[in-house]
Interface confidence: medium
């Protein structure tokens, strides 16, 4: 069962899945100037049996210039309603990711893939949050959100995370100093495109989990 909406957004924080539940789909998106090869897969699918999970299908991109009659591929309307995006991560994997039964690793990059990955999560998927660079958490413990099914509807639990600017000792948390760059938060209600920026390469994650940068919903 696909999750109906996006993991919740937290100001000055990004999220990342450490492993992907079977049934998760990853759109085959190509960077500008490239397109999916003709008859190429629309998406990769995490599938498997009790002992092993892996991504079915391969994403392949080719230069748009080779056939200028072909338009850039965009997701169909029914695909668009569940767009979850994360910026491409380092291929390094967190230590425990491979050992989770019924889960796939982060798929390796493919040639000329888009800079953002669009996932379609399934019920039971967990994502972890981290404050963006320059901000720190006011809570301790892993900040996670899980897609749950209740009364026939899916919902994401709310992560218990507040990110504060490290330099703001006398101000309230999260209040930004004027900067040249805009905040860069999406305003769309229909597709919350949360991009994970610099997730401190995942090998640090295991250590980080023990310290202060994540926290859980306690209700």
């Amino acid at each position: 069962e696909l999750c109906d909406d996006d993991p919740p957004e937290i100001p000055h924080a990004t999220f990342k899945a450490m492993a992907y539940k079977e049934g998760t789909m990853l759109n085959c998106e190509c960077k500008r100037g490239f397109r999916r090869i003709k008859s190429g897969s629309l998406y990769m699918l995490c599938t498997g049996n009790s002992s092993h999970s892996s991504w079915d299908n391969q994403c392949q991109c080719t230069s748009s210039a080779t056939r200028n009659t072909t338009k850039q591929v965009t997701p169909q309307p029914e695909e668009q309603k569940e767009r979850k995006t994360t910026e491409m991560q380092s291929p390094m994997q967190p230590v425990d990711q491979a050992s989770l039964p019924g889960h796939c690793r982060e798929p390796p990059p493919w040639e000329n893939e888009a800079t953002e990955r669009i996932y379609h999560f399934v019920v039971g998927q967990m994502v972890y949050y981290q404050c963006v660079q320059g901000y720190r958490a006011l809570h301790r413990g892993p900040a996670e959100s899980v897609c749950k099914m209740t009364h026939g509807k899916t919902r994401w639990t709310q992560p218990q995370l507040i990110c504060t600017g490290e330099m703001e000792t006398s101000q309230f948390p999260g209040e930004e100093k004027p900067q040249a760059s805009p905040e860069g938060r999406p305003e769309s209600e229909t597709s919350c495109l949360v991009t994970t920026t610099d997730f401190q390469i995942q090998t640090e994650m295991a250590a980080t989990m023990e310290t202060s940068i994540f926290t859980t919903e306690y209700q």
């Epitope: 937290i10 100001p11 639990t157 218990q160 101000q171 919350c192 202060s212 209700q219």
Partner: antibody, heavy 116, light 107 residues
Framework: QVQLVESGGGVVQPGRSLRLSCAAS????????MAWVRQAPGKGLEWVAV????????YYRDSVKGRFTISRDNAQNTLYLQMNSLRAEDTAVYYC?????????WGQGTLVTVSS | DIQMTQSPSSLSASVGDRVTITCRAS??????LNWYQQKPGEAPRRLIY???SLQSGVPSRFSGSGSGTDYTLTISSLQPEDFATYYC?????????FGQGTKLEIK
């Protein structure tokens, strides 16, 4: 079941001090940020102060900065608000709150009246 | 600080009515907006978070929408227990700030 119980409110003269306490139970207090929110009689709500899980980060609204101090005792599962140099405009019901991103659990509030 | 302005300040309606309360922020709050209900002598209760997500246990007649600086709380069919004061609150940047409230009264 999260429970927050405030105490320490009362009537106090301008310029005097008061210390509010909030006893927390039903969750891992030492993992969570806590805050004080106040509401003047018949008026709206405003955030007063916030403290990180370990007490290392504290934030205050401008009007109370330098007069109020938020602190916590994780061993006792208690949050405090030390209010000095109280003013008439500090008169309000003070709520202790947590769950700041997941639903907000509030205490029942304690009334502080600053009057001569 | 970000100023939150609610309208109307008070509103009279009848059971079964559809009611809309609006909230305008002095700057973009990026959909980081909550709605609360408060009854006399009680602590506030959050109804909606993140502009349009219904808090667990809140009836589906409550809904929220909006983006940027303009947000709306809608009660599709008023029930007797809905007569209360409603507040919006932004959590995009600190200090988090509330609107001045909208008092919903029985006509």
């Amino acid at each position: 079941q999260v429970q927050l119980v405030e105490s320490g409110g009362g009537v106090v003269q301008p310029g005097r001090s008061l210390r509010l306490s909030c006893a927390a139970s039903g969750f891992t207090f030492s993992n969570h940020a806590m805050a004080w929110v106040r509401q003047a009689p018949g008026k709206g709500l405003e955030w007063v102060a916030v403290i990180s899980y370990d007490g290392s980060n504290k934030y205050y609204r401008d009007s109370v900065k330098g007069r109020f101090t938020i602190s916590r005792d994780n061993a006792q599962n208690t949050l405090y608000l030390q209010m000095n140099s109280l003013r008439a405009e500090d008169t309000a019901v003070y709520y202790c709150t947590t769950g700041l991103n997941s639903g907000y659990d509030w205490g029942q509030g304690t009334l502080v009246t600053v009057s001569s | 600080d970000i100023q939150m302005t609610q309208s109307p300040s008070s509103l009279s309606a009848s059971v079964g009515d559809r009611v809309t309360i609006t909230c305008r922020a002095s700057q973009n709050v990026s959909s980081f907006l909550n709605w609360y209900q408060q009854k006399p002598g009680e602590a506030p209760r959050r109804l909606i978070y993140g502009t349009n997500s219904l808090q667990s246990g809140v009836p589906s007649r409550f809904s929220g929408s909006g983006s940027g600086t303009d947000y709306t709380l809608t009660i599709s069919s008023l029930q007797p227990e809905d007569f209360a004061t409603y507040y919006c609150q932004q959590y995009n940047s600190w200090p988090w700030t509330f609107g001045q409230g909208t008092k919903l009264e029985i006509k």
